[in-house]
């Protein structure tokens, strides 16, 4: 129907436009007219797929009309101007606004020209990560929790860890209708080696320029793991005093150290000083097994060490450790 040999006019618009829940968004739509082409626009129409009627119309003489006047506005179209820009602003975006929209120009002599635009309604989630403090259960339990609240679409959560383990992720409706809260747990069998180590929760979402990384320092509560150090099997008579140290790893921290021997209380040459045991010089050989008992809130554990003080110094004394 247009005159033969004319270049065609084109409606330009993005195929998809993102907008945030509660915010406003502009659906851009322009009529591109080739240099030598002439066109006359008399109406601009916006309609939504699946809905009856048009939601916004700009008429050459009647001006703008809207199905929801408080939520819609032609950005640039004005009476008495060339109607080449049909861009429409939508206010107070709702979840139900997501969908396909048609922008249409009624032109002469080319006729009607339209384009479809997909409006995506997004909601930026809030992300938190927290430790799940655990004890030695002997079975897999959550040790960290990562929550992405109120995202649309749902956020994608992954974990990065050198400790082994596996994720358990679930979704629930967010506070605002149409939004989703994603909760992801990092699950492993707790051990003392895990305590104090970190895992990282990575949250990805369309609304983020880059993924958000949240690091969690793990907490595993465990009773003391005890060992005694300071003895090198080369202690001899008539040498300086030496020290044994009760090395304890625990969470929470140890609340008490108790030294004893397999025979009962400490002999006179052994003096307890908290985590350390002072061994004074002796004048006759000894063969004593010392016990260090360490207590924390979860219980008590002990370690034993047999110390021998032998006769005759070596050619190069390396015996009882000097203070």
């Amino acid at each position: 129907w247009p005159p033969p040999g004319t270049g065609d006019i084109i409606v330009q618009a993005p195929t998809q436009v993102p907008g945030f829940l509660g915010d406003s968004v502009t659906l851009p739509c322009y009529l591109q007219v080739p240099g030598m082409e002439e066109t006359h626009v008399s109406q601009l129409t916006w309609s939504r797929h699946g809905e009856s009627g048009s939601m916004a119309v700009f008429h050459q003489t009647q001006g703008p009309n809207y199905s929801e006047p408080k939520r819609l506005e032609f950005v640039a179209a004005r009476l008495g101007t060339e109607l080449r820009d049909a861009s429409l602003r939508m206010f107070g975006l709702r979840v139900e606004d997501e969908g396909n929209y048609t922008c249409l120009f009624v032109t002469f002599p080319q006729g009607s020209r339209s384009v479809d635009i997909w409006l995506r309604v997004l909601a930026k989630p809030q992300n938190t990560a927290e430790v799940q403090k655990v004890q030695l259960t002997g079975k897999p339990v959550p040790v960290a929790r990562c929550v992405s609240t109120g995202g649309r679409p749902p956020a994608h959560i992954t974990w990065h860890s050198d400790l082994g383990g596996m994720p358990n992720t679930s979704q629930a409706p967010g506070f605002l209708s149409g939004t989703v809260t994603v909760t992801s747990l990092w699950i492993l069998v707790p051990s003392s080696q895990v305590d104090g180590k970190s895992v990282t929760c990575k949250v990805e979402h369309e609304s983020f320029e880059k993924p958000q990384l949240l690091t969690v320092n793990l907490t595993v509560y465990y009773p003391p793991e005890v060992s005694i150090s300071g003895y090198d099997n080369n202690w001899y008579l008539s040498q300086n005093e030496a020290t044994l140290t009760c090395d304890a790893r625990s969470n929470p921290e140890p609340t008490g150290y108790n030294w004893s021997t397999t025979m009962g209380p400490l002999p006179p040459f052994a003096v307890a000083q908290g985590a350390q045991l002072l061994i004074r010089p002796v004048d006759k050989p000894i063969n004593t097994t010392f016990i260090c008992n360490v207590t924390n809130a979860l219980g008590a554990r002990q370690a034993e060490l047999t110390v021998q003080v032998k006769e005759g110094p070596p050619s190069e004394p390396s015996g009882m450790s000097s203070n």
């Epitope: 005159p3 002439e38 006359h40 109406q43 048009s54 050459q60 006729g111």
Partner: antibody
Framework: EVQLVQSGSELKKPGASVKVSCKTS????????MHWVRQPHGKGLEWIGG????????SYNQRFKGRVTITVDKSTSTAYMELSSLRSEDTAVYYC?????????WGQGTLVTVSS | DIQMTQSPSAMSASVGDRVTITCKAS??????VAWYQQKPGQPPKALIY???YRYSGVPDRFSGSGSGTDFTLTISSLQAEDLAEYFC?????????FGQGTKLEIK
């Protein structure tokens, strides 16, 4: 006030041509497309074609197979519709109508009678 | 060409009645539909554009609805001065086409 005033009735013989005028006032002539629509007595409306006065672009209903020519005279804000090779079935009231996607203002109509 | 089929072709109703005229397009015309009122001996007068928007000055008892292929003109409370013929028209694609008309009489 927008007004479209058409020329008077015409009686034509088959094979002849007729040229109907439509003088406009009350608006800027070059800002609106002008179309022509006809209505045989007691029948429905039929779109003939239209023109944009600014550059003279036209669009015609193919049914009229080159028999119709729409023109304008910008100096007098007048639109014209000429229909040639008239036949009896062309007898109708011919309207000019200002186009805004729909037709918002119409002339009073011109009766063209084709009869031998 | 797109056919616009109007129904009924004629009807009579009483003052105060609710009157509905329908128009069916032979293919999708979006919302590019106008409705006109033509009183005897006069040219048509535009009532509705873009399927559902009233021209300024048109009484609010006239309303239009629909999109795609099915359209309706409703007169919520018929008045004596509404005696006329009513036409729908599509302007989605050339050639622009009209319905055959609905003649409305007052009982």
């Amino acid at each position: 006030e927008v007004q479209l005033v058409q020329s008077g009735s015409e009686l034509k013989k088959p094979g002849a041509s007729v040229k109907v005028s439509c003088k406009t006032s009350g608006y800027t002539f070059t800002e609106y497309t002008m179309h022509w629509v006809r209505q045989p007595h007691g029948k429905g409306l039929e779109w003939i074609g239209g023109i944009h006065p600014n550059q003279g672009e036209t669009s015609y209903n193919q049914r009229f197979k080159g028999r119709v020519t729409i023109t304008v005279d910008k100096s007098t804000s007048t639109a014209y519709m000429e229909l040639s090779s008239l036949r009896s079935e062309d007898t109708a009231v011919y309207y000019c109508a200002r186009w805004t996607g729909d037709f918002d203002y119409w002339g009073q109509g011109t009766l063209v009678t084709v009869s031998s | 060409d797109i056919q616009m089929t109007q129904s009924p072709s004629a009807m009579s109703a009483s003052v105060g009645d609710r009157v509905t005229i329908t128009c069916k397009a032979s293919q999708n015309v979006g919302t590019n539909v106008a409705w006109y009122q033509q009183k005897p001996g006069q040219p048509p007068k535009a009532l509705i554009y873009s399927a559902s928007y009233r021209y300024s000055g048109v009484p609010d008892r006239f309303s239009g609805s629909g999109s795609g292929t099915d359209f309706t003109l409703t007169i919520s409370s018929l008045q004596a001065e509404d005696l006329a013929e009513y036409f729908c028209q599509q302007y989605q694609s050339y050639p622009y086409t009209f319905g055959q008309g609905t003649k409305l009489e007052i009982k």
